[in-house]
């Protein structure tokens, strides 16, 4: 007998994971066999759609590989022409294991700023997100919070926040872990110990000490009066993100020494500076202070200038007079900037005889200053241009005046050979006579302040300059 369709197994809610199979069963009893149609959200499912499978004369609808978009209400309708059509509906809930769609990435952040490590997730039910730091679950506090999005926000990042992080997304279907990422906390360069200012005697050794920290560990550079330090030895050590730099100086002039700690944050740099002044206590000139002794010159710098086996005055106000005076000559030459081939040997002779003065042995060893005339010859003939440049620097305050006097004698204060020929020393290497005058460049200074005498010819007519040292 004909029988109207009856749905014996109403549709139920089906939970399915993405990419899984999902089947709705709509068991129907009727005679004759009914036509069964299916809808999703009231839209007819086409039976030739290859994403679906129809079995048992339409009583089973299978979605062969579930997608997110398959979520919705599915209805089966059975009709065999006897009585009315019957319908049953059920929901497909597309469940999804947690998936991290935007995982965290390595972050470098400067201490004190805000860091956000992303962790965006998908899943149904909505996954809960937690974070692991190192091997332990991360505890939230007033600075550290897991946002609604799953991202980790750290306010006022501290050094101890650095480490390895991963986010964990969890729902009833499973757990997803992000890869481990690194949070690196960078810290601006900071000086922990600034160099101290010193007031020292001329020729002293001074060690300036500068300690800095930062992440990455900063580099330390030293600046002397605005320029990179040219002399002195630097020793550095690094321990526990602290760099310790020691600059050892032989003091021949006052100066402002600056310690600069620098580290790099991406394309930017952070620097910290600290400065110390080195001043020189009033220094009694050697000729007025006879504390010293006579000794043969054993250095290198003035070898070519001083007479062989010459007795020179070594000033005991220095801890190591020989070394101190040798270094002083070297330093003095470096003070002279543009030095012409004419000036160089003359200046070399003047400086060597000024710093390593001839020594008169006796009960009280006495230094013999250079004769004024020889000094003026160097100043106003051989080195006229250079002398002017140096005097200009002195006036502009680039040299302290006493420092300038240490490098180059003040000719006017030296004894004249006319007063007492034994009271001052000649410069035998200045092979000069009036016939040579035409070889010198025209005078740039005004008329010499004193008559420059006919300086006696010396047996040596050539100037030898040690290549190890230059006057530039």
């Amino acid at each position: 007998l004909p029988k109207a369709p009856v749905i014996t197994t109403p549709l139920e809610t089906v939970d399915a994971l993405v990419e899984e199979v999902a089947t709705f069963m709509c068991a129907v009893e009727s005679y004759p066999q009914p036509e069964i149609s299916w809808t999703r959200n009231k839209i007819l499912i086409k039976l030739f759609d290859t994403r679906y499978s129809i079995r048992e004369n339409g009583q089973l609808l299978t979605i062969l590989s579930v997608e997110d978009s398959d979520d919705g209400i599915y209805c089966c309708t059975a009709n065999n022409g006897v009585g009315g059509a019957v319908e049953s509906c059920g929901a497909l809930q597309v469940k999804m294991k947690p998936k991290i769609t935007r995982p965290p990435i390595n972050v470098k952040i400067i201490e004190g700023l805000k860091a956000v490590l992303p962790c965006t997730t998908m899943g149904n039910p909505k996954p809960s997100v937690s974070w692991i730091k190192g091997d332990s679950p991360l505890r939230e506090n007033s600075r550290i919070a897991v946002l609604e999005s799953g991202s980790l926000r750290i306010h006022n990042v501290q050094k101890e926040d650095a480490g390895q992080y991963r986010c964990v997304a969890k729902n009833s279907l499973g757990t997803a872990y992000s890869k481990v990422v690194k949070l690196e906390v960078e810290v601006f360069a900071r000086i922990l110990r600034a160099p101290e200012s010193h007031n020292v005697t001329f020729g002293s050794f001074v060690t300036l000490h500068c300690t800095a920290t930062g992440i990455p560990v900063p580099t330390i550079t030293w600046i002397e009066n605005g320029n990179a330090v040219s002399s002195g030895s630097i020793q550095e050590s690094v321990k526990d993100r602290v760099i310790d730099s020691r600059l050892q100086l032989f003091i021949t002039k006052p100066g402002l020494y600056t310690c600069i700690a620098t580290n790099k944050h991406g394309e930017k740099f952070s620097t910290a500076k600290a400065a110390a002044t080195i001043s020189i206590a009033e220094w009694s000139k050697p000729q007025k202070d006879n504390k010293g002794y006579c000794a043969q010159y054993r250095g290198e710098v003035c070898n070519a200038v001083l007479a062989k086996d010459a007795l020179v005055f070594l000033n005991t106000s220095y801890a190591d007079p020989e070394e101190a005076q040798e270094l002083l000559v070297h330093t003095a030459w470096n003070e002279l900037k543009v030095v012409s081939p004419v000036c160089r040997p003359a200046a070399e002779a003047l400086l060597c005889n000024h710093i390593f003065q001839e020594c008169s042995p006796g009960v009280v060893p006495t230094p013999i200053p250079i004769c004024r005339e020889y000094c003026l010859a160097v100043k106003e003939l051989f080195c006229a241009k250079e002398w002017l440049v140096m005097e200009e620097k002195t006036h502009r305050g680039l040299y302290r005046s006493e420092m300038h006097l240490l490098s180059v004698p003040e000719c006017s204060k030296l004894p004249s050979m006319h007063w007492d020929p034994t009271a001052c020393a000649r410069l035998p290497h200045l092979d000069y006579n009036k016939e040579n005058l035409k070889t010198f460049p025209p005078m740039t200074s005004s008329k010499p302040s004193v008559d420059i005498p006919n300086l006696p010819s010396s047996s040596s007519s050539s100037f030898s300059v040690s290549p190890t040292y230059s006057m530039t």
Epitope: A16, E20, I54, E56, Q59
Partner: antibody, heavy 121, light 107 residues
């Protein structure tokens, strides 16, 4: 009484073809989905293919897709499996089975005795 | 495709023993799960359908349970004729798949 009888098995060389038949009786053949299931010597059961009552839907296991074709003849109450490009691994006893769907999910409530297919050179 | 995994692969038991065989699906299959018994040289025989329904003519010592992904076949008091290979099968997907089988032997 439901009866399913397979035939057409035998020895063939690799690459050759064979057609299996299953004669159905004792039930309304036109209203049931039918299946082929095979069992390699000493191995488990492997579903091979199915065909819906009106031949509208046909399904195949990945291992035979493109080589085997399922069909049915309602007038003759027969189910067929055309097997082409046979391989050594197709060697098995082939069963035809009726799919019963009532008061529960589909299940194979009736089976034939099977026919042996041997693929060997 | 949905994979079906049975455990154990084989087991020895004595007459009168209670025996359980497990079957796990690779995804949720509701209760679209059937159990078959096969004796040497014979076709399989349907025991349980829809996870827990006893096929007519099958002794009541056989029972099935489970839903979703985990299913169990239980034989309460093993009889000599029960020594056979048991297969689970899913019919949730149109690509029907069987478990690898569990061989039940006499101890």
């Amino acid at each position: 009484e439901v009866q399913l009888v397979e035939s057409g098995g035998g020895l063939v060389k690799p690459g050759e073809s064979l057609r299996l038949s299953c004669a159905a009786s004792g039930f309304n053949f036109s209203t049931y989905t039918m299946h082929w299931v095979r069992q390699a010597p000493g191995k488990g059961l492997e579903w091979v293919s199915s065909i819906s009552s009106r031949s509208a839907y046909k399904y195949y296991a990945d291992s035979v897709k493109g080589r085997f074709t399922i069909s049915r003849d309602i007038a003759k109450n027969s189910l067929y499996l055309q097997m082409n490009s046979l391989r050594a691994e197709d060697t098995a006893v082939y069963y035809c089975a009726r799919d019963f769907f009532q008061l529960g999910p589909p299940r194979f409530d009736s089976w034939g005795q099977g026919t042996l297919v041997t693929v060997s050179s | 495709d949905i994979q079906m995994t049975q455990s154990p692969s084989s087991l020895s038991a004595s007459i009168g023993d209670r025996v359980t065989i497990s079957c796990r699906a690779s995804q949720r299959i509701s209760s679209f799960l059937n159990w078959y018994q096969q004796k040497p040289g014979k076709p399989p025989n349907l025991l349980i359908y829809g996870a827990s329904n006893l096929q007519s003519g099958v002794p009541s010592r056989f029972s099935g349970s489970g839903s979703g992904t985990d299913f169990t076949l239980t034989i309460t008091s093993l009889q000599p004729e029960d020594y056979a290979i048991y297969y689970c099968q899913q019919s949730y997907s149109p690509m029907y798949t069987f478990g690898q089988g569990t061989s039940l032997e006499i101890k």
